[in-house]
Structure formats: C-alpha cells, structure tokens
Interface confidence: low
C-alpha cells in the first residue's frame, strides 16, 4: 500500500490567513490567524460589522483591513491613546487669528468665523462686511441700510405706515370716522391761510346805500368777516370779530371810526348779522336787535357819475389795507356764513361761484377745536429759552387730542439741519383698537405710552415737561422708557439742538428725511396745543396748510359702540 502523502504540502491554507497546517489522514486542518476564517483561512473577518462589538469599538470611523481593522477620526478630530476614541480639535485655540476680525467659534470637527447680525464673513479679507439688505429688496417702499442692519420706512405723508412685519407698508386707517359733510350754501371763510375767499364788485344806482345781511357761525375770536371799499380806495368799511364781538372800522373823507359791541358771538351757533347804512348812521344788528349805531356825517361811499361802485371782500382785505386800519387785526377767521344778502341784491352770483368749489364749502356741523386733516402742518417759531430759569430752555406741553387716524406726528421740533430733536407722535398699537403715544429724540423712541384707546368721542389729555435734565409725564399712564443713562444721552442731543434754532410744527413734519423720526405721517384729527402756558392759535402760525381748520373741528360721524368709546381716564381732558 502506498503511503498517503503529507496533505499540508503543498500548502492548502491561505498564506495570509493561516497560522499553521496540520496533516491528517487524507485531510488537513488550517488554523487561522486572528481576523481570518474559513477552511483554508481564506476569508477576512470584518471586525467593523461584528454585532458583538459594534463598529469595532471605534467612536467614529472603523476601517476593516485584511485580517485586521483600525479606528480613525473624522477631519477636525484627533485619536486618543486608546486608539478607539476621537477628540474634537479646538482650531480656534490652536491657530490664533484664524478668522481675522471676526469671532472664531469652535464647532465639532470644525470652526466657524462668526459675524454680528447684519454682517457677512469675507474669506478673502478675513473680516466682517456689512450686508446691504436694501439691495435685496427687503422693503416695500423705502429702505435705509446702516452698518449691521437696515430699516424700512413708508411714506407717511402719502398715508402709509409700516406694517407689523416691519417691511411692508399699509394705509393708515381711519379709527374714528368724522362727519365731513359740507354744503355749498355755506361759505367757508378760512379757505385760504392768507388771502381773500371771495371778491365781488357792485355797480348800483347812486341812491343805493351799503348793506350786508348774513348768518354767521364761528368759534374763532378774531378775524375779518367782510371788507368793503369804494372803487378808488378812498373810503372803506371793515366788519370783523375781536374778542368774539363784532367790530366795525370805517374810514371816508368825513370820518374815521372804530366801534365794538354786542354780545360775544363766537359760540359756534348761527348768528344773524346785519350791517345797514342809514341816512345818518350805520346800524349793526345781531338777531334783528340793534347792537351798534355808528354816526356818520355823509354817505359811506361817494357815488360817481350816477353810480355807486363798491368792492366787497370776504374773509380778508387787500394787502395794502393793513397799514390803513385804525386798529390792526389778524384777518384770519375760521367761520362760515350763509343766507347772505349784499347791497340788497340777494345771493346773486355768489352761490354760483362757490357751488363748484368744494374747498369753499363749509362743514354742516362743527365743534370747538382745531382740525388737522392729515394733509399738512402748521409752523410756529417759539422761544423755549427762559432767562429766569436756571435749567435754560424748557418745554411744557399740554395736548388735547381726538384723533381720527391712529398714526401721525402731533408735535415736532425741527432743527435748521433738518433733524428732529423732539417729536410726539401717535402710532397704532399692536393691540387691537388702541394707540401708543411715542416721544422721540431724532430716531430714538425715549418714551412709549402703551395701548391707549384714543380714537374715541372723548378728548384725551396729555401733559409733559422737558428740560435738559428730565422728561416728566404729568398724566398718569403706564409707560415704557429707555434706561436713565440712555435717556440722558438723548436729552443731551435735544439740549444741543435747543441751543440752536428750532421751529415748532404741529400736525406733522416738513420735508425731512424719512429716517429722521420713527413716525412721519401727518396727524389726522382734532388737537389743541398749549406750550409753556400759551394756547397756540393756528391763526397766528408762521404758515399753515389751508386744509387745517384753526377753530373748528368736525363732529364724530356716528356714536361708536360703548366698548369702542373708552379712553384711558387718565387722559380725559376736563378743560
């Protein structure tokens, strides 16, 4: 019998995987090295997939190799001495100035160069650069970019305000509808801030005498109702109001007179007034009762060539007349006349003239007060410096308001460099049906009086005083204010402005940049303003938009529901 050859020769085992080969009778046994398996140790064991030792015990990456495996780490991590666990590398500590002027922030396996909000990191320059959000069309109307941010603005003068998303614009809505009904039979005497409302010329037979009858309604205390003169300006008659009473001034070749009399008629009621030239006097009647009789030696106006020619001006007089008056008068008069009959000619021609001109029509119902329609401003020059006051300048303001729209600038001081060092504005609150009052220095809100129901039948009363050291609210309200340090910084800005020239604006702002104040819409509603103890009379303004009514305020359209007719009791004006 032939001997059975050695089964381990030639070697049947996988050279890489075997440890030893044992010859058996007509068979062999391969003993495998660790990491190999199979009859011939030809198969590598994948330790990374071993269910009894998940991921080969590696904390991050398990790399299988023939007959073995090893652990490795992801980028930004280093292997610990146990050759299994990885640890994050803090790149920010290892490499200073990794991010240049930006802030280096370590993150697992990496680092980030962080910039403040509104800035973007530039890899090349290793610095933070301002993001120009305005180039990304973030705003609906106007966008102002500044380092680190941007602000959207809406054109308040066109009736827009910033929406809650601080990007889009929405129309400032009416919160208290007013009765703006007018009648063409009622002639509005304050259509022009400066100038005559109506001019008529009469050519009548020489036997005619001057006469004027009309119903008159006003809350204004001073102004010109009617001025009449001869064609050659040699004689004139002025019918005016002073201190709420009728005043007559007249001048002709015979005499020069001024008389005031009768009851106060600036009571907002219709008063029937008649002025009639009699043979030896001029008779003035109110409600058909004689209140004045002015003696005159001859006719008021001298006829020429058989004709009496007379020019009549409503609510004003020609500019040159001002210097001729016996007693100067502010001609501006916010009032209405109706049922007029001039020179005994009835209403001839006048109704036709005014019928087509809406702005010559008077409101059917008015209340006492001043009305800002949301289309313009009034300008005053007020000296806030008080020589006797150690504090220097001071501003004591009382506002009585009944807004019709919930957003708008009520009062603003504007410097000659077009900044707005002080403004008091109204803004629709985030809470429904209420408004905030915002007091600002330039573009910084220093006080916010929150969630007041101001759009109400009731007038609201707000009182505050400001000097270089303090802003004090005298009406008891819940306010949100900036820190005392920040307030002092802002008051210092105001103090600097007050040492220069400031103009006072009511009802809005002149042409200043949108970004000059937090609010730029015109105020719409009724408002009376008292500054440093003086009630501001819009007839005395340096300039005033024609639509602002100095002494009349439209009535509320209809009674709102009780729930909507609430106003914070601390604001109620009892004056």
């Amino acid at each position: 019998v032939n001997a059975i050859p050695d089964q381990c020769s030639p070697l049947p085992c996988n050279e890489d995987g075997y440890m030893s080969c044992k010859d058996g009778k007509a068979s062999f046994t391969c003993t495998c090295k660790p990491g190999w398996q199979g009859e011939k140790c030809e198969f590598d064991i994948n330790e990374c997939k071993d269910p009894s030792n998940i991921n080969g015990g590696c904390s991050q990456i398990c790399d299988n190799t023939p007959g073995s495996y090893h652990c490795s780490c992801k980028s930004g991590f280093v292997m610990l001495s146990n050759k299994k666990d990885c640890k994050d590398v803090d790149e920010c500590s290892l490499k200073p100035n990794m991010c240049g002027t930006a802030v280096c922030k370590n993150i697992p396996g990496d680092f980030e160069c962080e910039c403040p909000e509104g800035y973007r990191y530039n890899l090349k320059s290793k610095s933070c650069e301002d993001v120009d959000e305005c180039s990304e069309n973030m705003c609906a109307q106007l966008c102002v970019n500044y380092p680190g941010g941007y602000t959207c603005y809406c054109d308040g003068k066109k009736g827009f305000k910033l929406a809650q998303d601080q990007k889009s614009c929405e129309a400032v809505s009416v919160c208290l509808p007013l009765n703006l009904d007018t009648k063409y039979e009622l002639l509005y005497l304050a259509e022009q801030f400066a100038g005559v409302v109506l001019y008529l010329k009469f050519r009548l037979p020489e036997i005619s005498r001057f006469s004027a009858e009309f119903d008159f309604r006003t809350y204004d205390s001073q102004g010109v109702i009617l001025y009449a003169e001869s064609i050659d300006h040699s004689a004139w008659l002025l019918i005016a109001l002073r201190g709420g009473k009728i005043e007559v001034q007249l001048k002709n070749e015979h005499t020069s007179k001024i008389t005031t009399g009768g009851d106060i008629i600036n009571n907002g009621l219709w008063n029937m007034v008649s002025v009639e030239e009699l043979e030896h006097s001029i008779s003035i009647k109110i409600a058909k009762e004689a209140v004045m009789d002015i003696n005159k030696p001859g006719p008021l106006f001298k006829p020429e060539n058989g004709l009496l020619e007379t020019k009549v001006y409503f609510a004003g007089f020609p500019r040159k007349v001002e210097s001729e008056l016996i007693k100067p008068i502010n001609p501006r008069l916010d009032g209405c006349i109706r049922s007029w009959n001039l020179m005994k000619q009835g209403a001839s021609g006048i109704k036709e003239i005014i019928q087509e001109k809406q702005n010559k029509h008077c409101l059917v119902t008015v209340e006492k007060g001043s009305y800002y329609p949301g289309s313009g401003i009034a300008e005053f020059h007020i000296d806030y410096n008080n020589g006797s006051n150690a504090e220097g300048w001071h501003i004591n303001v009382t506002l009585n308001i009944r807004p019709s729209m919930g957003t708008g600038v009520m009062l603003a001081l504007v410097s000659s460099n077009n900044t707005v060092p002080f403004a008091v504005s109204l803004v629709d609150s985030t809470s429904e049906k209420s408004q905030d009052i915002v007091i600002s220095v330039e573009n910084t809100v220093i006080y916010r009086i929150q969630a007041l129901s101001l759009c109400s039948n009731q007038r609201s009363h707000l009182e505050f005083r400001v000097n270089r050291n303090n802003l004090e609210l005298l009406t008891p309200l819940k306010i949100e204010t900036i820190s005392q340090e920040e307030l002092q910084t802002q008051l210092a800005i105001l103090d600097k402005a007050m040492k220069g020239k400031v103009a006072t604006y009511l009802g809005g702002l002149p042409d200043v940049p949108f970004s000059a104040t937090p609010v730029n819409a015109f105020y719409n509603g009724c408002m009376e303003v008292n500054i440093n103890g003086v009630e501001l009379d819009l007839d005395e303004a340096i300039s005033k938009h024609n639509d602002i009514r100095a002494h009349s305020c439209p009535s509320v359209w209809k009674k709102t529901k009780n729930s909507e007719d609430q106003v914070d009791p601390r604001l109620i004006d009892g004056k």
Epitope: R459, H461, I572, G574
Partner: antibody
C-alpha cells in the same frame, strides 16, 4: 389677589409727626402707582398724595393742603409705601386709606388707619 | 380744580323703588367714577367710565350722563344697596371727589 394693609395711625398732638405705612401684595409693586386718600366727616374723601412707579422715577404729587408737610415714599424691596406727616393740624384728623392707582384711578383700597390730631 | 356737587346729600327709598342720585361737574367731556362705601369699610369702585359696572356689581345699577350732570340709578332698591355713594372725576391733579349721597332704606 390685591391686598393693601395700612398701619401707624394713632393719637398725636398738633405740631407733631407721624408715619403711616402700607404693605402691599398681589401685584407687581415696583410698577404700581400708589396713593393716600383721607376721609373725615368735615371734608369727606380727600386725595392726599401719590407716588409713581419705577418707570416714572418715583415722581411724587401732593394736594395743596399737605404740600411741604407730608412726604410720600416707597420701598420696592418691601412692597411698601409710606406717608411721613409733619406739622400736623387738627384738620388732618381722619381715616387714611392706602390706594393702588390703576387705569380706573382708585381701584383698590386698604381698610384704613385712623389718625387723631388733638391736644 | 373740578368741584363735584352731589345731590341729594341724604335720601331714603323703599325696597323695589327706583333711585336716582346726581353729580354735577364742570365738564361733559370727562368720564365719571362712582364709589360705594358702607360703614366701617373703605370705599369701593362701583361704576367706571360713566356707565360701566365693576365686576360683581348687580345689574340693577346703572350710570349715565346728560350734559355736565351725571347720574347713578338703581332700578329697584334692595336693602344691601343702603350705603354712601361718592362720585369722582379726573382732570389732572388734584383728584377730586363729590361730597357723597347717603342712601338709606325706608
């Protein structure tokens, strides 16, 4: 629940001094506006003084009849308001109430403490 | 300073009877506040903003205004309504109260 508790009343001679205290609870005291109102048979209800919250720098206001004689103060850490009364007169006699002034004015009142000024 | 005049100073009413007391101020543009006070207790805010009842005040109470005259009305008097009622208006400092109307049950 809002609670206001006055203390410190009693009998004092004309020209003398007295300090009233009011301990408050049940609301954010530092923001609150607090006041004192007194009541006497002769004068009825009469507002005396008011002190505003932190946001208003604790501004104080007084009725003409007590100006210069009475001082209102507060300690926000103790949720307390005080009324220091000097140069007391017979007409200052009455029940002094501590009030929380909210949007509805004198919305909450304490039970009152009685001051008698008499020789 | 507002002067508030309450009338009548004292009145009495039978159970079920309608009661009206008035308070005259200087201004019709202000809201009126009413307080109820019972002997030995402090005043309690009863009606605010002229016509709104404080929570818990019976619906038989109402407040109204006519010109510068303000009224508190009880539609049907009950024994528990016997108290002194004070009116108050606010027009800046000082805060002012009316002299009170003492309502007794007959």
């Amino acid at each position: 629940e809002v609670k206001l508790e006055e203390s410190g009343g009693g009998l004092v001679q004309p020209g003398g001094s007295m300090k009233l205290s009011c301990a408050a609870s049940g609301f954010t005291f530092s923001d609150a506006w607090m006041g004192w109102v007194r009541q006497s048979p002769e004068k009825g209800l009469e507002w005396v003084a008011e002190i505003r919250g932190k946001a208003n720098n604790h501004a104080t206001y007084y009725s003409e009849s007590v100006k210069g004689r009475f001082t209102i103060s507060r300690d926000d850490s103790k949720s307390s308001v005080y009324l220091q009364m000097n140069s007391l007169r017979a007409e200052d006699t009455g029940i002094f109430y501590c009030c929380l002034i909210t949007a509805f004015l004198f919305d909450y009142w304490g039970q009152g403490t009685t001051l008698t000024v008499s020789s | 300073q507002i002067v508030l005049t309450q009338s009548p100073a004292i009145m009495s009413a039978s159970p079920g009877e309608k009661v009206t007391m008035t308070c005259s101020g200087r201004s019709s543009e202000n809201y009126m506040y009413w307080y109820q006070q019972k002997p030995g207790s402090p005043p309690r805010l009863w009606i605010y903003d002229t016509s709104n009842l404080v929570s818990g005040v019976p619906a038989r109470f109402s407040g109204s205004r006519s010109g510068t005259s303000y009224s508190l009305t009880i539609s049907s008097m009950e024994a528990e309504d016997a108290a002194t009622y004070y009116c108050q208006q606010f027009n800046g400092y000082p805060y002012t109260f009316g002299g009170g109307t003492k309502l007794e049950i007959r």
